[in-house]
């Protein structure tokens, strides 16, 4: 008789999850040689230990502490790029501007990017069938708690001028319910962070509106100002040109507004 299995509303663990995490860890130590000392086997064991045999709606930040410890990494605190709902462009940017870092450029973010995982209470099995959905099932699921934990730590580490890339094509350019809006904004340290600079990325070719005047951006400015951090905002009217100018800043066309 097959054992009864909890059906969740979200997709199950990404196939070949253990192999993927291990391979990514090894790859990361290769492309980031300063992390040569990281023991990828121990990293996987700590990752697994955070959710295996635990109820997938009952995960805490504490569960991830052994993994956080092993993944401790110093990134230049004044070179942090946060993003919300515009991951691909943020990653394209840091691939060109190699001295800036998104969360997914750190070891822990790189390991988990685009993956789903969960276990089952009291069994050592990984659930490849379904995992809890944040809205429909529960918020304290393995994936959500992981990203909340690493996002908080990343924001806490930031200093000087912190940049955030926001998607100007969305109805809520700044969304209080996003990871940026609910976690990172509230964990920037006013004693270390002087300014949050928002880059609002325009979607349409002919969109010349000043999206820095959007009500949700004003809401972000208000939240940040109340935390004694200065706020500034720039429109990026042409993201393609913006990336091109990051690659070739001497280009004569790069002096004009992008």
């Amino acid at each position: 008789v097959p054992r009864w299995r909890q059906q969740w509303s979200g997709p199950g663990t990404t196939k070949r999850f253990p192999e993927t995490v291990l391979a990514r860890c090894v790859k990361y130590t290769e492309i980031h040689p300063e992390m040569r000392h990281v023991d990828c086997q121990s990293v996987w064991d700590a990752f697994k230990g955070a959710f295996i045999s635990k109820h997938p709606c009952n995960i805490t930040e504490e569960d991830y502490q052994p993994l956080m410890k092993l993944g401790t990494q110093t990134v230049p605190c004044n070179k942090i790029l946060l993003w919300s709902r515009i991951k691909d462009l943020a990653h394209q940017f840091t691939q060109v501007q190699r001295d800036m870092f998104t969360l997914e450029d750190t070891l822990l973010g790189y390991l988990a990017d685009d993956l789903t995982w969960c276990g089952e209470f009291n069994t050592s099995k990984i659930n490849y069938q379904s995992c809890p959905d944040w809205r429909k099932d529960c918020s304290n699921n393995p994936v959500s708690v992981f990203w909340k934990t690493v996002s908080r730590r990343f924001a806490e580490a930031a200093c000087d001028v912190v940049h955030v890339m926001l998607n100007g094509s969305r109805s809520k350019i700044f969304d209080k319910n996003s990871t940026f809006g609910s976690v990172e904004v509230h964990n920037l340290q006013p004693e270390k962070v002087q300014t949050l600079e928002a880059w609002v990325i325009h979607g349409g070719r002919e969109d010349s509106r000043d999206l820095c005047q959007d009500p949700t951006i004003k809401e972000l400015e208000s939240i940040i100002s109340k935390r004694n951090i200065q706020f500034s905002c720039k429109n990026i009217y042409r993201p393609d040109k913006f990336l091109q100018c990051v690659k070739n800043p001497e280009d004569s066309s790069c002096t004009s507004e992008i």
Partner: antibody, heavy 114, light 107 residues
Framework: QVQLVQSGAEVKKPGASVKVSCKAS????????VEWIRQRPGQGLEWMGV????????NYAQKFQGRVTMTVDRSSTTAYMELSRLRSDDTAVYYC???????WGQGTLVTVSS | DIQMTQSPSSLSASVGDRVTITCRAS??????VAWYQQKPGKSPKQLIY???NRYTGVPSRFSGSGSGTDFTLTISSLQPEDLATYYC?????????FGQGTKLEIK
């Protein structure tokens, strides 16, 4: 326990090639990068390059580029370092080492002499 | 390539002495520095990683410090078995590079 056991000493003529092996045991072979370092007689340590046993991708020091080839055989958990067009100043002890916790092989003496 | 300049190239000290070896990188390497001990006729043994972290089993008399370009290995109380050559290595960027070594002799 983790062990890296290297092949025995070799004597080669100038212009020849040498292939040194490094048999890994006691850990998951594809989970750690393997690097190669050499030490000429009475000299310091010189880093040659690194290989990812999982993907086979390599990164060589410029000095050895074009002469060194690092490979792995995953079925036997063995890493190899081949150095071609040998010269007398390639006479050295060649070491393999594993990323994380700094495990090293015992070294292989390669003597290049006519 | 990043140059690692180690000093002194040799030193002689007595049992119980505090010994300091320094290493200077030609450019900023953050904390991506390791220290190795090589005893005569043996493979090198890694003592320190990330500039200041001791590997398991390494005696507490060995400590590392520094970041950026200047790094130090300290032996707080020299023991007879510490007779060896010590090397620093940067692993911030490929190719990894070693200092030229410090030969430590016991008086």
């Amino acid at each position: 326990q983790v062990q890296l056991v290297q092949s025995g000493a070799e004597v080669k003529k100038p212009g020849a090639s040498v292939k040194v092996s490094c048999k890994a045991s006691g850990y998951a072979f594809t989970t750690y990068l393997v690097e190669w370092i050499r030490q000429r007689p009475g000299q310091g340590l010189e880093w040659m390059g690194v290989i990812n046993p999982g993907s086979g991708s390599t990164n060589y020091a410029q000095k050895f580029q074009g002469r060194v080839t690092m490979t792995v055989d995953r079925s036997s958990t063995t890493a190899y370092m081949e150095l071609s067009r040998l010269r007398s100043d390639d006479t050295a002890v060649y070491y393999c080492a594993r990323y994380a916790y700094g495990y090293w092989g015992q070294g292989t003496l390669v003597t290049v002499s006519s | 390539d990043i140059q690692m300049t180690q000093s002194p190239s040799s030193l002689s000290a007595s049992v119980g002495d505090r010994v300091t070896i320094t290493c200077r990188a030609s450019q900023n390497v953050g904390t991506a520095v390791a220290w190795y001990q090589q005893k005569p006729g043996k493979s090198p043994k890694q003592l320190i990683y990330s500039a200041s972290n001791r590997y398991t089993g390494v005696p507490s008399r060995f400590s590392g410090s520094g970041s950026g370009t200047d790094f130090t290995l300290t032996i707080s109380s020299l023991q007879p078995e510490d007779l060896a050559t010590y090397y620093c290595q940067q692993y911030s960027t490929y190719p990894f590079t070693f200092g030229q070594g410090t030969k430590l002799e016991i008086k």
